[in-house]
Protein backbone atom coordinates (compact mmCIF):
# COMPACT_ATOMS: atom_id res chain seq x y z
CA UNK A 1 0.00 0.00 0.00
CA UNK A 2 1.10 3.54 -0.67
CA UNK A 3 0.78 6.76 1.27
CA UNK A 4 4.39 6.85 2.50
CA UNK A 5 5.84 10.12 3.73
CA UNK A 6 8.93 11.56 2.11
CA UNK A 7 12.12 10.21 3.72
CA UNK A 8 12.98 13.58 5.21
CA UNK A 9 9.54 13.79 6.79
CA UNK A 10 10.03 10.42 8.44
CA UNK A 11 13.46 11.34 9.78
CA UNK A 12 12.02 14.50 11.28
CA UNK A 13 9.03 12.57 12.62
CA UNK A 14 11.24 10.11 14.45
CA UNK A 15 12.75 12.94 16.51
CA UNK A 16 9.35 13.81 17.97
CA UNK A 17 7.61 12.36 21.00
CA UNK A 18 4.40 10.76 19.82
CA UNK A 19 3.17 9.48 23.18
CA UNK A 20 -0.60 9.67 23.38
CA UNK A 21 -3.50 8.82 25.65
CA UNK A 22 -6.99 7.59 24.87
CA UNK A 23 -10.31 7.07 26.58
CA UNK A 24 -13.43 5.17 25.55
CA UNK A 25 -17.06 6.03 26.16
CA UNK A 26 -19.51 3.16 25.81
CA UNK A 27 -23.05 3.66 24.54
CA UNK A 28 -22.36 7.36 24.41
CA UNK A 29 -24.77 7.94 21.55
CA UNK A 30 -27.48 5.30 21.65
CA UNK A 31 -25.68 2.02 21.00
CA UNK A 32 -22.63 3.79 19.55
CA UNK A 33 -19.34 3.76 21.44
CA UNK A 34 -16.60 6.35 21.08
CA UNK A 35 -12.84 6.29 21.36
CA UNK A 36 -10.90 9.53 21.71
CA UNK A 37 -7.12 9.89 21.53
CA UNK A 38 -4.79 12.87 21.75
CA UNK A 39 -1.07 13.49 21.87
CA UNK A 40 0.32 14.22 25.30
CA UNK A 41 2.56 16.93 23.85
CA UNK A 42 0.26 19.70 22.60
CA UNK A 43 3.04 21.02 20.35
CA UNK A 44 3.30 17.89 18.19
CA UNK A 45 2.92 18.76 14.52
CA UNK A 46 -0.05 16.58 13.62
CA UNK A 47 0.05 17.32 9.89
CA UNK A 48 0.02 13.99 8.01
CA UNK A 49 -0.38 12.02 11.26
CA UNK A 50 -3.25 9.60 11.63
CA UNK A 51 -4.45 7.23 14.32
CA UNK A 52 -5.52 3.70 13.48
CA UNK A 53 -7.04 0.97 15.65
CA UNK A 54 -6.69 -2.69 14.70
CA UNK A 55 -8.02 -5.80 16.41
CA UNK A 56 -10.94 -6.50 18.77
CA UNK A 57 -13.29 -5.03 16.16
CA UNK A 58 -16.36 -6.47 14.45
CA UNK A 59 -16.62 -6.37 10.63
CA UNK A 60 -13.28 -4.70 9.97
CA UNK A 61 -9.68 -5.44 10.86
CA UNK A 62 -8.72 -1.78 11.29
CA UNK A 63 -10.40 1.59 11.53
CA UNK A 64 -9.06 5.06 10.92
CA UNK A 65 -9.75 7.83 13.42
CA UNK A 66 -11.39 11.08 12.43
CA UNK A 67 -9.40 14.20 13.24
CA UNK A 68 -11.06 17.23 14.80
CA UNK A 69 -8.61 20.00 15.65
CA UNK A 70 -6.07 18.31 17.93
CA UNK A 71 -8.11 15.27 18.94
CA UNK A 72 -8.74 12.04 17.07
CA UNK A 73 -11.89 10.02 17.56
CA UNK A 74 -14.03 7.16 16.36
CA UNK A 75 -17.74 6.71 16.98
CA UNK A 76 -18.98 3.22 16.13
CA UNK A 77 -20.86 0.15 17.34
CA UNK A 78 -18.08 -2.08 16.09
CA UNK A 79 -15.85 -2.39 19.16
CA UNK A 80 -15.81 -6.02 20.27
CA UNK A 81 -15.07 -5.03 23.91
CA UNK A 82 -13.22 -8.30 24.41
CA UNK A 83 -9.44 -8.41 24.23
CA UNK A 84 -6.89 -5.78 23.33
CA UNK A 85 -6.78 -3.47 20.35
CA UNK A 86 -3.61 -2.05 18.84
CA UNK A 87 -3.77 1.74 18.49
CA UNK A 88 -1.05 3.28 16.33
CA UNK A 89 0.06 6.73 15.23
CA UNK A 90 0.83 6.47 11.53
CA UNK A 91 2.46 8.43 8.75
CA UNK A 92 1.16 6.72 5.64
CA UNK A 93 1.83 3.02 6.25
CA UNK A 94 4.61 3.60 8.79
CA UNK A 95 3.69 3.23 12.48
CA UNK A 96 5.48 5.78 14.66
CA UNK A 97 4.23 4.45 17.99
CA UNK A 98 1.62 1.92 19.10
CA UNK A 99 -0.16 0.85 22.28
CA UNK A 100 -2.07 -2.35 23.00
CA UNK A 101 -5.17 -1.31 24.91
CA UNK A 102 -8.28 -3.08 26.18
CA UNK A 103 -11.01 -0.50 25.59
CA UNK A 104 -12.87 -1.68 28.71
CA UNK A 105 -9.98 -0.44 30.88
CA UNK A 106 -9.95 3.16 29.61
CA UNK A 107 -13.60 4.01 30.09
CA UNK A 108 -14.48 7.60 30.90
CA UNK A 109 -18.13 7.88 31.98
CA UNK A 110 -20.36 10.73 30.92
CA UNK A 111 -20.59 13.57 33.41
CA UNK A 112 -23.46 13.47 35.90
CA UNK A 113 -26.18 16.08 35.42
CA UNK A 114 -29.23 17.63 37.10
CA UNK A 115 -27.34 18.17 40.34
CA UNK A 116 -29.50 19.86 42.96
CA UNK A 117 -29.55 20.48 46.70
CA UNK A 118 -32.72 20.72 48.78
CA UNK A 119 -32.74 21.95 52.37
CA UNK A 120 -34.96 19.98 54.75
CA UNK A 121 -35.82 22.28 57.63
CA UNK A 122 -37.29 19.64 59.90
CA UNK A 123 -34.40 17.25 59.43
CA UNK A 124 -31.74 19.96 59.57
CA UNK A 125 -29.97 18.58 56.54
CA UNK A 126 -29.41 19.05 52.82
CA UNK A 127 -30.38 16.35 50.33
CA UNK A 128 -28.05 16.27 47.33
CA UNK A 129 -29.36 14.48 44.25
CA UNK A 130 -28.05 14.11 40.73
CA UNK A 131 -28.64 12.01 37.66
CA UNK A 132 -26.43 9.89 35.42
CA UNK A 133 -27.10 8.53 31.95
CA UNK A 134 -25.37 5.32 33.00
CA UNK A 135 -28.42 4.03 34.87
CA UNK A 136 -29.93 3.27 31.44
CA UNK A 137 -26.83 1.69 29.91
CA UNK A 138 -26.17 -1.97 29.17
CA UNK A 139 -22.42 -1.93 29.85
CA UNK A 140 -21.09 0.70 32.26
CA UNK A 141 -23.92 0.70 34.82
CA UNK A 142 -22.02 0.61 38.11
CA UNK A 143 -20.19 3.80 38.99
CA UNK A 144 -18.48 5.38 41.95
CA UNK A 145 -19.38 9.05 42.32
CA UNK A 146 -17.26 11.76 43.87
CA UNK A 147 -19.27 14.65 45.30
CA UNK A 148 -17.11 17.66 46.05
CA UNK A 149 -18.27 20.75 47.86
CA UNK A 150 -16.67 23.88 49.27
CA UNK A 151 -17.54 27.18 50.77
CA UNK A 152 -17.33 29.63 47.90
CA UNK A 153 -14.73 31.77 49.64
CA UNK A 154 -12.42 28.76 50.19
CA UNK A 155 -10.81 28.50 46.79
CA UNK A 156 -9.13 25.09 47.18
CA UNK A 157 -10.70 23.58 50.31
CA UNK A 158 -12.89 20.96 48.71
CA UNK A 159 -14.55 18.28 50.79
CA UNK A 160 -15.03 15.01 48.90
CA UNK A 161 -17.58 12.28 49.52
CA UNK A 162 -17.53 8.99 47.58
CA UNK A 163 -20.80 7.16 47.06
CA UNK A 164 -22.35 4.59 44.74
CA UNK A 165 -25.89 5.98 44.81
CA UNK A 166 -27.09 9.25 43.31
CA UNK A 167 -28.32 10.69 46.60
CA UNK A 168 -26.34 12.14 49.48
CA UNK A 169 -27.38 13.78 52.73
CA UNK A 170 -25.24 16.57 54.17
CA UNK A 171 -25.86 17.40 57.82
CA UNK A 172 -26.54 21.05 58.47
CA UNK A 173 -24.23 21.12 61.51
CA UNK A 174 -21.29 20.11 59.31
CA UNK A 175 -21.68 23.26 57.22
CA UNK A 176 -21.05 26.89 58.05
CA UNK A 177 -24.18 28.96 58.60
CA UNK A 178 -25.16 31.79 56.26
CA UNK A 179 -22.57 30.69 53.73
CA UNK A 180 -22.64 30.16 49.98
CA UNK A 181 -21.51 26.70 48.89
CA UNK A 182 -20.51 25.27 45.54
CA UNK A 183 -21.07 21.56 44.88
CA UNK A 184 -20.23 19.35 41.90
CA UNK A 185 -20.02 15.63 41.10
CA UNK A 186 -18.08 13.29 38.81
CA UNK A 187 -18.10 9.52 38.19
CA UNK A 188 -15.68 6.66 37.58
CA UNK A 189 -16.32 3.02 36.54
CA UNK A 190 -16.57 0.75 39.59
CA UNK A 191 -17.32 -2.79 38.40
CA UNK A 192 -15.58 -4.81 35.68
CA UNK A 193 -14.88 -1.69 33.60
CA UNK A 194 -11.91 0.45 34.55
CA UNK A 195 -10.82 3.88 33.52
CA UNK A 196 -10.93 7.55 34.36
CA UNK A 197 -13.01 10.12 36.14
CA UNK A 198 -15.70 11.76 34.06
CA UNK A 199 -15.77 15.49 33.59
CA UNK A 200 -17.32 17.34 36.50
CA UNK A 201 -21.01 18.09 36.37
CA UNK A 202 -21.95 21.75 36.18
CA UNK A 203 -21.66 23.25 39.66
CA UNK A 204 -24.71 23.93 41.80
CA UNK A 205 -24.71 26.77 44.32
CA UNK A 206 -26.70 26.87 47.54
CA UNK A 207 -26.79 29.01 50.67
CA UNK A 208 -27.00 27.67 54.22
CA UNK A 209 -29.48 29.35 56.60
CA UNK A 210 -28.37 31.74 59.28
CA UNK A 211 -28.13 30.62 62.94
CA UNK A 212 -31.35 31.04 64.89
CA UNK A 213 -30.07 32.94 68.00
CA UNK A 214 -32.59 31.49 70.46
CA UNK A 215 -31.90 27.84 69.68
CA UNK A 216 -28.38 28.07 68.33
CA UNK A 217 -29.62 26.38 65.19
CA UNK A 218 -29.70 27.66 61.65
CA UNK A 219 -32.89 29.19 60.30
Amino acid sequence: ESGYAQNGDLEDAELDDYSFSCYSQLEVNGSQHSLTCAFEDPDVNTTNLEFEICGALVEVKCLNFRKLQEIYFIETKKFLLIGKSNICVKVGEKSLTCKKIDLTTIVKPEAPFDLSVIYREGANDFVVTFNTSHLQKKYVKVLMHDVAYRQEKDENKWTHVNLSSTKLTLLQRKLQPAAMYEIKVRSIPDHYFKGFWSEWSPSYYFRTPEINNSSGEMD
Epitope: S2, G3, E59, V60, L63, R66
Partner: antibody, heavy 122, light 107 residues
Protein backbone atom coordinates in the same frame (compact mmCIF):
# COMPACT_ATOMS: atom_id res chain seq x y z
CA UNK B 1 -29.00 14.20 -4.01
CA UNK B 2 -25.76 12.26 -4.13
CA UNK B 3 -24.18 12.03 -7.57
CA UNK B 4 -20.91 10.55 -8.85
CA UNK B 5 -19.96 11.15 -12.48
CA UNK B 6 -16.89 9.50 -13.99
CA UNK B 7 -15.04 10.80 -17.03
CA UNK B 8 -11.74 10.33 -18.81
CA UNK B 9 -12.22 6.84 -20.24
CA UNK B 10 -11.32 5.95 -23.78
CA UNK B 11 -9.09 3.92 -26.06
CA UNK B 12 -5.41 3.74 -25.15
CA UNK B 13 -2.51 1.63 -26.38
CA UNK B 14 -0.75 -0.89 -24.12
CA UNK B 15 1.89 0.89 -22.07
CA UNK B 16 -0.06 4.15 -22.29
CA UNK B 17 -1.58 6.30 -19.57
CA UNK B 18 -5.02 7.63 -18.75
CA UNK B 19 -6.43 9.75 -15.96
CA UNK B 20 -9.97 9.13 -14.78
CA UNK B 21 -11.95 11.72 -12.86
CA UNK B 22 -15.03 11.39 -10.68
CA UNK B 23 -16.99 14.56 -9.96
CA UNK B 24 -19.12 14.26 -6.84
CA UNK B 25 -22.00 16.31 -5.49
CA UNK B 26 -24.66 16.06 -2.81
CA UNK B 27 -22.31 15.20 0.06
CA UNK B 28 -19.12 16.41 1.71
CA UNK B 29 -16.34 14.55 -0.07
CA UNK B 30 -13.81 15.11 2.74
CA UNK B 31 -15.96 13.02 5.11
CA UNK B 32 -15.68 9.84 3.05
CA UNK B 33 -13.24 7.20 2.00
CA UNK B 34 -13.62 6.76 -1.76
CA UNK B 35 -12.90 3.88 -4.10
CA UNK B 36 -12.49 2.82 -7.71
CA UNK B 37 -13.95 -0.52 -8.77
CA UNK B 38 -13.79 -1.98 -12.25
CA UNK B 39 -15.62 -4.58 -14.31
CA UNK B 40 -14.11 -6.19 -17.38
CA UNK B 41 -16.61 -6.88 -20.19
CA UNK B 42 -18.79 -9.85 -19.21
CA UNK B 43 -16.83 -10.38 -15.97
CA UNK B 44 -17.27 -9.72 -12.28
CA UNK B 45 -16.40 -6.77 -10.07
CA UNK B 46 -12.79 -6.06 -9.09
CA UNK B 47 -11.69 -3.54 -6.49
CA UNK B 48 -8.98 -1.21 -7.83
CA UNK B 49 -8.17 1.35 -5.14
CA UNK B 50 -9.33 3.15 -2.00
CA UNK B 51 -8.27 6.49 -0.54
CA UNK B 52 -8.92 7.51 3.05
CA UNK B 53 -11.07 10.52 3.93
CA UNK B 54 -7.99 12.60 4.71
CA UNK B 55 -6.23 11.44 1.55
CA UNK B 56 -3.21 10.33 3.60
CA UNK B 57 -3.77 6.60 3.10
CA UNK B 58 -4.16 4.79 -0.21
CA UNK B 59 -4.75 1.11 -0.87
CA UNK B 60 -4.32 -1.07 -3.97
CA UNK B 61 -4.48 -4.73 -4.94
CA UNK B 62 -1.28 -6.30 -6.29
CA UNK B 63 -2.71 -6.24 -9.82
CA UNK B 64 -2.44 -2.44 -10.08
CA UNK B 65 0.06 -1.53 -7.35
CA UNK B 66 2.87 0.64 -8.71
CA UNK B 67 0.93 1.45 -11.88
CA UNK B 68 -2.22 3.18 -10.61
CA UNK B 69 -2.45 6.15 -8.25
CA UNK B 70 -5.63 7.29 -6.54
CA UNK B 71 -5.93 10.90 -5.38
CA UNK B 72 -8.54 13.40 -4.38
CA UNK B 73 -9.14 17.14 -4.39
CA UNK B 74 -11.79 17.81 -1.78
CA UNK B 75 -11.94 21.50 -2.69
CA UNK B 76 -12.84 20.55 -6.27
CA UNK B 77 -15.16 17.72 -5.16
CA UNK B 78 -13.17 15.34 -7.32
CA UNK B 79 -11.63 11.89 -7.14
CA UNK B 80 -8.96 10.76 -9.60
CA UNK B 81 -7.31 7.60 -10.83
CA UNK B 82 -4.02 7.97 -12.68
CA UNK B 83 -3.39 4.80 -14.68
CA UNK B 84 0.07 4.18 -16.14
CA UNK B 85 1.65 1.23 -17.96
CA UNK B 86 -1.77 0.09 -19.05
CA UNK B 87 -2.29 -3.51 -20.13
CA UNK B 88 -4.98 -5.27 -22.15
CA UNK B 89 -6.29 -6.83 -18.93
CA UNK B 90 -7.05 -3.34 -17.55
CA UNK B 91 -9.84 -3.02 -20.13
CA UNK B 92 -13.01 -2.49 -18.10
CA UNK B 93 -15.75 -0.15 -17.03
CA UNK B 94 -14.35 1.86 -14.11
CA UNK B 95 -16.75 2.96 -11.39
CA UNK B 96 -16.08 5.39 -8.59
CA UNK B 97 -17.95 4.46 -5.44
CA UNK B 98 -18.74 6.00 -2.07
CA UNK B 99 -19.10 3.97 1.13
CA UNK B 100 -22.36 4.11 3.05
CA UNK B 101 -20.57 5.16 6.25
CA UNK B 102 -18.57 8.36 6.58
CA UNK B 103 -15.03 8.48 8.05
CA UNK B 104 -13.31 5.47 9.66
CA UNK B 105 -13.14 2.96 6.76
CA UNK B 106 -16.17 0.71 6.40
CA UNK B 107 -15.79 -0.11 2.72
CA UNK B 108 -19.20 -1.18 1.48
CA UNK B 109 -20.59 1.06 -1.20
CA UNK B 110 -24.05 2.56 -1.50
CA UNK B 111 -23.40 5.13 -4.23
CA UNK B 112 -21.78 4.33 -7.56
CA UNK B 113 -21.18 6.37 -10.69
CA UNK B 114 -22.45 5.25 -14.08
CA UNK B 115 -18.97 4.07 -15.03
CA UNK B 116 -16.49 5.04 -17.74
CA UNK B 117 -15.11 2.54 -20.23
CA UNK B 118 -11.35 2.14 -20.59
CA UNK B 119 -10.18 0.07 -23.56
CA UNK B 120 -6.52 -0.91 -23.77
CA UNK B 121 -5.75 -2.18 -27.24
CA UNK B 122 -3.18 -1.76 -29.97
CA UNK C 1 -5.33 -12.09 0.94
CA UNK C 2 -8.90 -13.20 1.61
CA UNK C 3 -10.34 -15.43 -1.13
CA UNK C 4 -14.06 -15.36 -1.95
CA UNK C 5 -15.95 -18.37 -3.29
CA UNK C 6 -19.49 -17.60 -4.38
CA UNK C 7 -21.92 -20.30 -5.44
CA UNK C 8 -23.68 -21.15 -7.58
CA UNK C 9 -22.29 -19.14 -10.49
CA UNK C 10 -25.74 -19.21 -12.06
CA UNK C 11 -29.19 -20.55 -11.28
CA UNK C 12 -32.57 -20.73 -12.95
CA UNK C 13 -35.66 -20.03 -10.89
CA UNK C 14 -39.30 -19.06 -11.22
CA UNK C 15 -41.21 -16.12 -9.82
CA UNK C 16 -42.19 -16.97 -6.23
CA UNK C 17 -39.26 -19.33 -5.67
CA UNK C 18 -37.01 -19.11 -2.64
CA UNK C 19 -33.45 -18.49 -3.77
CA UNK C 20 -30.28 -18.93 -1.73
CA UNK C 21 -26.81 -17.74 -2.74
CA UNK C 22 -23.76 -18.55 -0.64
CA UNK C 23 -20.41 -16.93 -0.18
CA UNK C 24 -17.47 -18.58 1.55
CA UNK C 25 -14.31 -16.74 2.62
CA UNK C 26 -10.86 -18.19 3.13
CA UNK C 27 -10.70 -16.77 6.66
CA UNK C 28 -13.01 -15.33 9.30
CA UNK C 29 -14.21 -11.89 8.20
CA UNK C 30 -16.23 -11.18 11.35
CA UNK C 31 -19.39 -10.31 9.40
CA UNK C 32 -17.58 -7.76 7.24
CA UNK C 33 -19.65 -8.79 4.24
CA UNK C 34 -21.91 -6.95 1.80
CA UNK C 35 -24.22 -8.14 -0.99
CA UNK C 36 -24.96 -6.26 -4.23
CA UNK C 37 -27.40 -6.65 -7.10
CA UNK C 38 -26.38 -5.67 -10.63
CA UNK C 39 -28.47 -5.48 -13.78
CA UNK C 40 -26.95 -5.36 -17.29
CA UNK C 41 -25.43 -2.00 -18.17
CA UNK C 42 -26.05 -0.62 -14.68
CA UNK C 43 -23.90 -0.01 -11.61
CA UNK C 44 -24.28 -2.42 -8.68
CA UNK C 45 -26.79 -1.66 -5.89
CA UNK C 46 -26.09 -2.32 -2.23
CA UNK C 47 -28.56 -4.79 -0.71
CA UNK C 48 -27.04 -5.95 2.57
CA UNK C 49 -24.07 -5.00 4.75
CA UNK C 50 -22.72 -6.22 8.10
CA UNK C 51 -23.71 -9.67 6.75
CA UNK C 52 -27.33 -9.26 7.83
CA UNK C 53 -28.34 -5.57 7.77
CA UNK C 54 -30.75 -4.69 4.98
CA UNK C 55 -29.87 -1.43 3.25
CA UNK C 56 -32.56 1.23 3.36
CA UNK C 57 -35.15 0.84 0.61
CA UNK C 58 -34.32 -2.81 -0.10
CA UNK C 59 -37.42 -5.04 -0.06
CA UNK C 60 -37.78 -7.29 2.98
CA UNK C 61 -37.82 -10.44 0.80
CA UNK C 62 -34.03 -10.05 0.73
CA UNK C 63 -32.12 -11.18 3.80
CA UNK C 64 -28.52 -11.87 4.70
CA UNK C 65 -27.11 -14.20 7.31
CA UNK C 66 -23.91 -15.90 8.33
CA UNK C 67 -20.77 -15.49 10.38
CA UNK C 68 -17.19 -16.66 10.39
CA UNK C 69 -16.46 -17.81 6.85
CA UNK C 70 -19.94 -18.78 5.59
CA UNK C 71 -22.55 -16.26 4.44
CA UNK C 72 -25.89 -16.46 2.66
CA UNK C 73 -28.17 -14.14 0.70
CA UNK C 74 -31.77 -15.32 0.57
CA UNK C 75 -34.61 -14.06 -1.61
CA UNK C 76 -37.73 -15.46 0.05
CA UNK C 77 -40.05 -15.06 -2.94
CA UNK C 78 -38.41 -14.19 -6.23
CA UNK C 79 -40.00 -11.27 -8.11
CA UNK C 80 -39.60 -10.43 -11.83
CA UNK C 81 -37.35 -7.47 -11.01
CA UNK C 82 -34.97 -9.71 -9.03
CA UNK C 83 -33.52 -11.41 -12.12
CA UNK C 84 -29.99 -10.02 -12.05
CA UNK C 85 -26.43 -10.86 -11.02
CA UNK C 86 -25.57 -10.86 -7.30
CA UNK C 87 -22.13 -10.29 -5.77
CA UNK C 88 -20.79 -10.68 -2.27
CA UNK C 89 -17.93 -8.46 -1.08
CA UNK C 90 -15.69 -8.71 1.97
CA UNK C 91 -14.56 -5.44 3.53
CA UNK C 92 -12.94 -6.88 6.65
CA UNK C 93 -9.44 -6.28 5.30
CA UNK C 94 -7.52 -5.00 2.31
CA UNK C 95 -7.39 -5.99 -0.45
CA UNK C 96 -11.16 -5.73 -0.70
CA UNK C 97 -12.57 -8.65 -2.66
CA UNK C 98 -15.76 -9.56 -4.51
CA UNK C 99 -17.19 -12.99 -5.13
CA UNK C 100 -17.40 -14.18 -8.72
CA UNK C 101 -21.11 -13.41 -8.95
CA UNK C 102 -24.32 -15.42 -9.23
CA UNK C 103 -26.54 -14.86 -12.25
CA UNK C 104 -30.22 -15.47 -11.42
CA UNK C 105 -32.09 -16.31 -14.60
CA UNK C 106 -35.72 -17.04 -15.43
CA UNK C 107 -36.51 -20.73 -15.63
Amino acid sequence: QVQLVESGGGLVKPGGSLRLSCAVSGFTLSDYYMAWIRQAPGKGLEWVSTISASGLRTYYPDSVKGRFTISRDNAKNSLYLQMNSLRAEDTAVYYCARPLSAHYGFNYFDYWGQGTLVTVSS
Amino acid sequence: DIQMTQSPSSLSASVGDRVTITCRTSEDIYQGLAWYQQKPGKAPKLLVYSANTLHIGVPSRFSGSGSGTDYTLTISSLQPEDFATYYCQQYYDYPLAFGGGTKVEIK
